[in-house]
């Protein structure tokens, strides 16, 4: 099209996580998806200076079609600020990521004590469960509901019936997955909810219970307000 346009970000969700704490020897990928007309170019800076291939052993890869910078097998000297500069003749935009290369021993995910917490609400109400996860490696997080099938919580093998309600995916940010919202609660929503976090070392999970109470009856509301009676 002939509509000239300065560069702009096309997927800010993929750029929300600015601080990347990555274990040594792992691969790091920074993305700055952008658009513009004419199509902008992208370059990368490390600590405010031009980032050259010879600045790191093994160099790095730039995938222009994915607007990404990839560094394999990171080492402590890779720590620092990485800035993508996206520009065309009508303007320039930039975004900075901070990379920390972690050398401590990676461990199972740690879930904050007391979370998620037991909750109760009335039918029609809203509730949220929160799960705070600490992990050296990027954890995969799931919210699971223990469900019943044919009136039973357990299958013929003695294992519980489970339903994955929410899982971290490509389009899910860390903040989004840490909270499970249940809107317009029904009696069927009552039960056990589990926040599960796993990484390459292992899996950890905490559970909480949702209690659903009946909403105040319609008759009670009317008798409590005689003004409304004809």
């Amino acid at each position: 099209s002939n509509n000239k346009r300065a560069p702009y970000w096309t997927n800010t969700e993929k750029m929300e996580k600015r601080l990347h704490a990555v274990p040594a020897a792992n691969t790091v990928k920074f993305r700055c998806p952008a658009g513009g007309n004419p199509m902008p170019t992208m370059r990368w800076l490390k600590n405010g200076k031009e980032f050259k291939q010879e600045h790191r052993i093994g160099g790095y890869k730039v995938r222009n079609q994915h607007w990404s910078l990839i560094m394999e097998s990171v080492v402590p000297s890779d720590k620092g600020n990485y800035t993508c500069v996206v520009e065309n003749e009508y303007g320039s935009i930039n975004h900075t990521y901070h990379l920390d290369v972690v050398e401590r021993s990676p461990h199972r995910p740690i879930l904050q004590a007391g979370l998620p917490a037991n909750a109760s609400t009335v039918v029609g109400g809203d509730v949220e469960f929160v799960c705070k996860v600490y992990s050296d490696a990027q954890p995969h997080i799931q919210w699971i509901k223990h469900v019943e099938k044919n009136g039973s919580k357990y299958g013929p093998d003695g294992l519980p019936y489970l339903k994955v309600l929410k899982a971290a995916g490509v389009n899910t940010t860390d903040k989004e997955i840490e909270v499970l919202y249940i809107r317009n609660v029904t009696f069927e929503d009552a039960g056990e909810y589990t926040c599960l976090a796993g990484n390459s070392i292992g899996i950890s999970f905490h559970s909480a219970w949702l209690t659903v109470l009946p909403a105040p009856g319609r008759e009670k509301e009317i008798t409590a307000s005689p003004d409304y009676l004809e």
């Epitope: 020897a25 792992n26 796993g198 292992g202």
Partner: antibody, heavy 124, light 112 residues
């Protein structure tokens, strides 16, 4: 049946390279972290490396860091260990071990299934 | 790194008698999720290790109930209530809480 089958072992001179493979079957390979563990002749067990289910995270024992590289091909259900700059002390049986899965587990979350092992001898 | 120290080095047991193996970790293996991540394995001659006990005291499927695991955050015990001929081999404890995963030095059990 859940199975892990290692291959690629052999006799090699110090300083040379060797690539081990582990073929997985009977489970959803792409949903599990995978480990390599080794055992020198007549000795105990030593953990070598782990790779996450999608290959994005890798960790190594200090004794092999910078020399060994763990990788996986989920489309082929295969785990690999590229061993460079081999030393006499790397002589061992190398076991492929299933690690933690991605979902809720009812039993152990990994280290339950081991392969039969493949022997690597580093000798001049 | 977490150091796993196993005792005794070897054990000679009469069939039908009990046996006990100890393992101590240099740091607590009690995780924030309330589980204690110590595993026990038996390695029979010429075979890979086989899982006996996971998360301190849970028997793996197919493991006879004569095997039991117990302990606290740093001190763990594997007990065999009545040793049988098929129980011979080397027993290892392992910590599964952080990398590098580490194993005890092993306890060789033989029949008198």
């Amino acid at each position: 049946e859940v199975q892990l089958l290692e291959s690629g072992g052999g006799v090699v001179q110090p300083g040379r390279s060797l690539r081990l493979s582990c073929a997985a079957s009977g489970f959803t390979f792409s949903s599990y972290a995978m480990h390599w563990v080794r055992q020198a002749p007549g000795k105990g067990l030593e953990w070598v490396a782990v790779i996450s289910y999608d290959g994005s995270n890798k960790y190594y024992a200090d004794s092999v860091k910078g020399r060994f590289t763990i990788s996986r091909d989920n489309s082929k259900n295969t785990l690999s260990l590229q061993m460079n700059s081999l030393r006499v002390e790397d002589t061992a049986i190398y076991y492929c071990v299933r690690g933690a899965g991605r979902g809720y587990t009812y039993g152990p979350d990994g280290f339950d299934i081991w392969g039969q092992g493949t022997m690597v001898t580093v000798s001049s | 790194d977490i150091v796993m120290t196993q005792t005794p080095l070897s054990l000679s047991v009469t069939p039908g008698q009990p046996a006990s193996i100890s393992c101590r970790s240099s740091r607590s293996l009690l995780h924030s999720d309330g589980k204690t991540y110590v595993y026990w394995y038996l390695q029979k001659p010429g075979q890979p290790p086989q899982l006996l006990i996971y998360e301190l005291s849970n028997r793996f499927s197919g493991v006879p109930d004569r095997f039991s695991g117990s302990g606290s955050g740093t001190d763990f015990t594997l007990k065999i209530s009545r040793v049988e001929a098929e129980d011979v081999g080397v027993y290892y404890c392992m910590q599964y809480i952080e990398a590098p995963l580490t194993f005890g030095g092993g306890t060789k059990v033989e029949i008198k």
